[in-house]
């Protein structure tokens, strides 16, 4: 037989087996010009002294065979033998190591048989009712096609699905979507309507993540804050990578997460934006105040689940200089200025209320005034901090009060709200005698001292009706007693206390009159 | 001249089985397509199975699981093996390639 024509004679081997996991596979044949034809398979497992053996069975009933030596290519003419225009059986015969594997075979009329490609370039996936649609732009002059579609999970072997048959310009396929897991898919295509015409290659994988992203597992640690008034949200653990299937490992687009973190000042309601999403990997500072913080896992399909933390705000107060004069007008604070034109928040509620309940101002931007101090002013109308209650205050700056994630912490303190000089007076101050010469004053804690930081110290004033002779008594605001001793006996005294801040002298207490008994002894 | 004998056929049993032979001359069983056709009385002759180059197989549906066609390239004879055999399966067996025929064995399947 001449090596370019298909030989009638029986192929110099012995019978092939039924098949086996190795040997020849993948069988395809095509027209490749007007009158030239060329069939190609693939050869699973070693290759050493493997001789393939094109088979062809006639519709006449004649069978004959090309043999392609170690090739496991093989170009033919239409005078080779082979009828073109007829149907014929082809399948390859592969003798190594003495036996024989064949591969299955392919039923087709050559002649009409045209390669056709899978789908080339672009695939776009997209999610349609609880299912995946992919869609492609139809391989040039072969519209009209049947398509198939293999895909496997990382933990799933390959399982083939059906396309159906495509007749335009654009082809599509609906898959099957994984909840939870990523997928990898190839589509494959075929002559339509042309009896056994051979299957193109499958197409590059199109990877496609689960439908919902994992939920992301991440831990957030956050800095104490610094003396720029700014704290560090740190990553204490990474999210976890999706597993992918084989084909997606390494470069796969498509199964992205994308993990984006979303930032909600709860503190300074009154600013002007009090959201912002930022990539995951861009860690941010964040002032002292209070955060929600949500991870959120997105993919290709929308956003996932996600996880949300709350950061509280950082408690610790200074004693700082925020100097508070209340005037007739009304009350002005002022603080160690940050910067040139900075914008500040200044944010008060009453202690031991719901965070909910805080009240916010926002100052245009100012610029320090001659002493590099800050102000805010309001008047008594305002009802500001009007009720003779203890009020927590936090200032926060920023010269970029739009961007959340440029806010700082300035200080926070206390103040006692209302006219504190009065509400804060000492009140039940009881005298007991202590000795012949001294007496124990008592008195109940000022309303001042439910404000840490507020009250400076309490004053005991002690007079002589007699001589008139006044001494006064430095208390820590601590204590609520002291002893006043060097008094006589027979004498009347009054006894008056007051509760002093740092920036206010306290009003009086009510005069409280008492005498040592003379002692008679017998 | 080419030649191809039936042989095997008979009487059986519903559920039981027969082994089909047909010995080919003048041609190779391992470059042709044989077949296996049967003709029951009144009706149409109809393929049951094939052999192509000693190695592709095909069936008709109603046999598929039930018979086995099989060659032996070096007797150059071909079989059919049939197992689970039913009344219907009651028919002239033939064997043909190319353009020959054999004369036919007849298979009854009764109880």
């Known amino acids: 037989c001449r090596t370019s024509e298909c030989c009638f004679q029986d192929p110099p081997y012995p019978d092939a087996d039924s098949g086996s996991a190795s040997g020849p596979r993948d069988l395809r044949c095509y027209r490749i010009s007007s009158d030239r034809y060329e069939c190609s398979w693939q050869y699973e497992g070693p290759t050493a002294g493997v001789s393939h053996f094109l088979r062809c069975c006639l519709s006449s009933g004649r069978c004959c065979y090309f043999a392609a030596g170690s090739a496991t290519r093989l170009q033919f003419s239409d005078q080779a033998g082979v009828s073109v225009l007829y149907t014929v059986t082809l399948w390859v015969e592969s003798w190594a190591r003495n036996q024989t594997e064949k591969s299955p075979e392919v039923t087709l009329q050559l002649y009409n048989s045209v390669k056709y490609e899978p789908p080339l370039g672009d695939i776009k996936v997209s999610k349609l009712a609880g299912q995946l649609r992919m869609e492609w732009e139809t391989p040039d002059n072969q519209v009209g096609a049947e398509v198939q579609f293999r895909h496997r999970t990382p933990s799933s072997p390959w399982k083939l699905g059906d396309c159906g048959p495509q007749d335009d310009d654009t082809e599509s396929c609906l898959c099957p979507l994984e909840m939870n897991v990523a997928q990898e898919f190839q589509l494959r295509r075929r002559q339509l309507g042309s009896q056994g015409s051979s299957w193109s290659k499958w197409s590059s994988p199109v990877c496609v993540p689960p439908e919902n992203p994992p939920q992301p597992q991440v831990r957030f640690s956050v800095e104490q804050l610094g003396q720029d008034g700014r704290r560090r949200l740190t990553l204490k653990e990474q999210p976890t990578q999706l597993e992918l299937p084989e084909g997606c490992q390494g470069l796969a687009p498509g199964t992205e997460v994308t993990y984006r973190l979303q930032l909600h000042m709860l503190s300074c309601p009154c600013k002007a934006k009090a959201t912002r999403t930022l990539h995951l990997g861009k860690m941010p500072y964040l002032s002292g105040a209070a955060y929600n913080v949500a991870v959120i896992s997105s993919n290709q399909f929308g956003p996932g689940l996600n996880q949300t933390w709350h950061i509280p705000a950082d408690t610790h107060t200074e004693p700082v200089a925020l100097n508070i004069s209340v005037g007739t007008n009304g009350t002005t604070m002022y603080w160690p200025a940050r910067a040139q034109s900075m914008t500040y928040c200044i944010e008060w509620q009453p202690v031991g209320q719901d965070g909910g309940l805080a009240t916010c101002s926002l100052t245009a931007p100012q610029d320090p005034d001659p002493a590099g101090m800050a102000t805010y002013s309001w008047s008594r109308e305002s009802g500001a901090m009007g009720q003779e209650k203890c009020y927590y205050i936090t200032i926060f700056a920023s010269a970029h009060p739009e961007k959340l994630t440029l806010w700082s912490t300035v200080l926070s303190t206390y103040h006692f709200g209302g006219n504190a000089s009065a509400a804060g007076t000492p009140h039940h101050v009881s005298v007991k005698n202590h000795s012949l010469d001294s007496v124990s004053v008592d008195w109940a804690p000022s309303l001042l001292s439910t404000c840490p930081g507020v009250l400076k110290e309490y004053v005991v004033r002690c007079r002589d009706e007699d001589s008139k002779q006044v001494s006064e008594h430095p208390v820590q605001p601590t204590e609520t007693q002291v002893t006043l001793s060097g008094l006589r006996a027979g004498v009347a005294y009054t006894v008056q206390v007051r509760a002093d801040t740092a920036w206010l002298r306290g009003v009086w207490s009510q005069p409280q009159r008492f005498s040592i008994e003379v002692q008679v002894s017998d | 001249e080419v030649q191809l004998v039936e042989s095997g056929g008979g009487l059986v049993q519903p559920g039981g089985s027969l082994r089909l032979s047909c010995a080919v001359s003048?041609?190779?069983?391992?470059?042709?397509?044989v077949n296996w056709y049967r003709q029951a009385p009144g009706k149409q002759r109809e393929l049951v199975a094939l052999i192509m180059g000693g190695a592709i197989r095909k069936y008709a549906d109603d046999v598929k699981g039930r018979f086995t066609i099989s060659s032996d390239s070096a007797k150059n004879t071909v079989y059919l093996q049939m197992n689970s055999l039913r009344p219907e399966d009651t028919a002239v067996y033939y064997c043909?390639?190319?353009?020959?025929w054999g004369q036919g064995t007849q298979v009854t399947v009764s109880s």
């Open positions: 043909s390639a190319l353009e020959y």
């Open positions: 003048g041609i190779s069983v391992r470059s042709s397509v």
